[in-house]
């Protein structure tokens, strides 16, 4: 053999009770001694610091806390140095070290000892992580080194965890032993933060211990808050709140379209949009996550605004007789009641949509003009104003006319045409034609789609000659014999040489 | 020079105390363990026992517990030996002895007496 | 407890000559721990406290004569005192002190 000592590294007793500290020693064989003595010393193994004696065996004499209270249960000679204390308070927690005394010069300290922790709770072993919906052993274990007194186990709070289930005396690995029981339930999210005890009491005693954990409870996240659909006017502060229930708190974020806009580590997280913009109207979905598992909730986000001036797409170039299809369109919310007006006329309305599609079926001149495309919800009004030219062949209308006056003849070719005709003047009887180029004898104004051709000629007053007005553009040309009108109708002053 | 000085004979009653003393000089007093050896007239030598000079413990032999124990006074560097309820056959020379002490930790081992006191006779006598 | 046993109990020799004193233990006094024996040799002379010679079974003490040697392991032990002087007259005691410490019974050692 060697010196050597065998006694747990820690053991436990509840306050009141005892506890047994197992302990084995060894020495050298050769040591041989006809007794063998042994001291048992509290808090420090150096006799010279005088540490209080716990058991002596060479005499009764020990420190004042442990009188009365110490005993030896193991036979020295047997190399066995088992103590017995008894009715243990807190200040007889600490550690303890064994001194073999052989005679001679052989006394020996074993740097081996035990520490004594005097406790008055249960001890509640709930595994490091209980996940809601997974079944889960929670563990109530007491020390049971007393000999004289068995601690028995009831539980606290656990009405709906299931029964439990004693496992009775179980010697841990240094020899100590404990009182185990067993609870095994499927916790569920309300679990979380439920306090569950365990108590120990001994029989035929009013010792009885108490001690209680707080289960928390890992489970995913649900979203329990959040708005519903929200209606905002463009420029004003919008505010959409995340809230979720979940353990341990979960990553929020909020996303648009795929772009995360704000997140973080908590119960609630607020998005902030400070003046929406119409930009900003669409779906806002918060994501809850955690190392459990995930939830996720949608809100629409409408921005409310007037309508945006609308835009006229479509032929503003047509020929007569032609249909003529127009697509007036903005962008508002609510949607717009749409009005094409001419010449504040309606010509066609719609309400609640985006977009007008105006049809003019073989279309005439009388088609032709400024329209508008007017557009307005509850937040303001916008126009747009569009011109749609319709193209003809000329017509010569009824006001064309001659009239002589003294030695002057003036004629007017009316014309109404689109795009602008050339006019021209002919003289059969002179065989002369006058085109509106020749600036010296006819002059042209336009009106609109009217185009007035005035052909002066001097000195014909007595025989006024037949006159003839073509009108010619891209679609056809017309011809007017201009009649003359009496003197006595048109009456013409010239002035000057 | 080590010595070990003893207190002079003693002539006791039966049931008397008498107590020995033994001073100590030239080394470190608390290095050493301090013997007792005891020797009837005409007879061998007896162990009694032995004080740690450094702790203060004392160790007894297995026939001198109770009457008798073992004191130090370090600040003289001296043992002292007390033997209380004194019978007849507690007359004898009584030795004082050192003996070196290797401390290693909280242990140590000893080991043989190498100086000894003079002596000091003891008898007890009605 | 050790019992320690001497022979002779008492031993005459000639000046000059050599003397042996032998020492039983009843167990060993080997320590395996450091493989010495604990054992020891002492010379008291009448009136007089006695006197260590040899220590570990075999080491002299300073001071001592080489005259003395010692010898054995174990359980079995011998001091040995080669040419003998007048000096040498006195009780010898073996000792061993591995565990409770006792003496063998002393051997007188005289002049023939």
């Known amino acids: 053999g060697h010196w050597g000592a065998w006694m747990p590294s820690s053991i436990s007793a509840f306050e009141g009770t005892c506890v047994s500290i197992p302990c084995r020693f060894d020495f050298p064989d050769e040591l041989r001694p006809a007794v063998v003595h042994g001291v048992w010393y509290f808090n420090s193994p150096y006799p010279k610091n005088y540490p209080p004696v716990v058991f002596k065996s060479r005499t009764q004499v020990v420190h004042e806390s442990f009188q009365g209270r110490s005993r030896l249960l193991g036979d020295l000679g047997l190399r066995n140095c088992t103590l017995l204390l008894s009715n243990v308070s807190p200040e007889l927690g600490g550690k303890y070290y064994f001194r073999g005394d052989l005679g001679g010069y052989n006394q020996y300290t074993f740097s081996e000892h035990s520490v004594l922790d005097i406790v008055n709770t249960p001890n509640i072993v709930v595994p490091p992580e209980v996940v809601a919906g997974t079944e889960v052993e929670v563990s109530c274990m007491v020390p049971d080194n007393c000999p004289e007194l068995r601690p028995e186990l009831s539980w606290l709070g656990h009405e709906g965890l299931g029964e439990p289930a004693v496992l009775g005396r179980l010697r841990e690995d240094e020899g100590t032993w404990v009182q185990v029981s067993l609870l095994h339930f499927v916790p569920t999210r309300e679990a979380n933060g439920h306090r569950l005890g365990c108590q120990a009491s001994f029989p035929n005693t009013t010792l009885q211990f108490e001690g209680y954990a707080s289960m928390d409870v890992k489970y995913p996240p649900v979203i329990v808050e959040m708005n519903s659909s929200v209606e905002a006017i463009e420029g004003s502060h919008v505010s959409l709140l995340c809230g979720a229930d979940s353990n341990p708190p979960p990553l929020l974020t909020w996303m648009r379209d795929g772009t995360v806009l704000r997140e973080a580590v908590a119960e609630s997280l607020l998005l902030e949009l400070e003046e929406v913009t119409p930009a900003e109207d669409g779906v806002y979905a918060c994501l809850a996550e955690n190392a459990y598992g995930q939830d996720n909730r949608t809100v629409g986000l409408s921005v409310m605004y007037a309508p945006w001036k609308p835009t006229v797409n479509g032929t503003m170039v047509a020929v007569e007789g032609e249909t003529v299809s127009i697509l007036c369109s903005t962008q508002s919310n609510p949607d717009p009641i749409l009005t094409i007006f001419k010449e504040k006329q309606i010509l066609s309305t719609v309400i609640y949509e985006s977009e007008l599609q105006l049809e003019l079926p073989a279309v005439s001149p009388e088609d032709d003009g400024e329209y508008w495309c007017v557009a307005e919800n509850q937040y303001g009004q916008r126009a747009t104003a569009f011109n749609l030219s319709v193209e003809f062949a000329p017509v010569l209308l009824l006001e064309s006319h001659c009239a002589a006056a003294r030695d002057t003849v003036q004629c007017l070719c009316v014309v109404k045409s689109n795009p602008e005709p050339s006019v021209a003047f002919e003289l059969p009887s002179r065989n002369v034609t006058v085109n509106e180029s020749e600036r010296e004898f006819v002059y042209s104004e336009r009106s609109g789609l009217v185009l007035t051709s005035i052909l002066t000629l001097r000195g014909q007053a007595q025989a006024p000659p037949r006159v003839i007005c073509t009108a010619r553009n891209l679609y056809g040309a017309k011809s007017l014999e201009l009649p003359f009108q009496g003197a006595h109708r048109l009456m013409w002053a010239k002035i000057g040489p | 020079q080590v010595q070990l000085v003893q207190s002079g004979s003693e002539l006791k009653k039966p049931g008397a105390s008498v107590k020995v003393s033994c001073k100590a000089s030239g080394y470190t007093f608390t290095n050493y363990g301090m013997n007792w050896v005891r020797q009837a007239p005409g007879q061998g030598l007896e162990w009694m026992g032995w004080?740690?000079?450094?702790?203060?413990?004392?160790t007894y032999a297995d026939d001198f517990t109770g009457r008798f124990v073992f004191s130090l006074d370090t600040s003289v560097s001296t043992a002292y030996l007390q033997i209380s309820s004194l019978k007849a056959e507690d007359t004898a020379v009584y030795y004082c002895?050192?003996?070196?002490?290797?401390?290693?930790?909280?242990?140590?081992?000893?080991?043989?007496?190498?100086?000894w006191g003079q002596g000091t006779l003891v008898t007890v006598s009605s | 407890d050790i019992v320690m046993t001497q022979s002779p109990d008492s031993l005459a020799v000639s000046l000059g000559e050599r003397a042996t004193i032998n020492c039983k233990s009843s167990?060993?006094?080997?320590?395996?721990?450091?493989?010495?024996?604990?054992l020891a040799w002492y010379q008291q002379k009448p009136g007089q406290p006695p006197k260590l010679l040899i220590y570990w079974a075999s080491t002299r003490e300073s001071g001592v004569p080489d005259r003395f040697s010692g010898s054995g392991s174990g359980t079995d032990f011998t001091l040995t005192i080669i040419n003998l002087h007048t000096e040498d007259v006195a009780v010898y005691y073996c000792?061993?002190?591995?565990?409770?410490?006792?003496f063998g019974q002393g051997t007188k050692l005289e002049i023939k």
């Open positions: 004080i740690n000079t450094y702790t203060g413990e004392p």
């Open positions: 167990h060993s006094v080997l320590y395996s721990s450091n493989q010495k024996n604990y």
């Open positions: 002895a050192r003996n070196p002490i290797n401390y290693y930790g909280i242990n140590y081992e000893g080991y043989v007496m190498d100086y």
């Open positions: 000792h061993q002190y591995l565990s409770s410490l006792t």
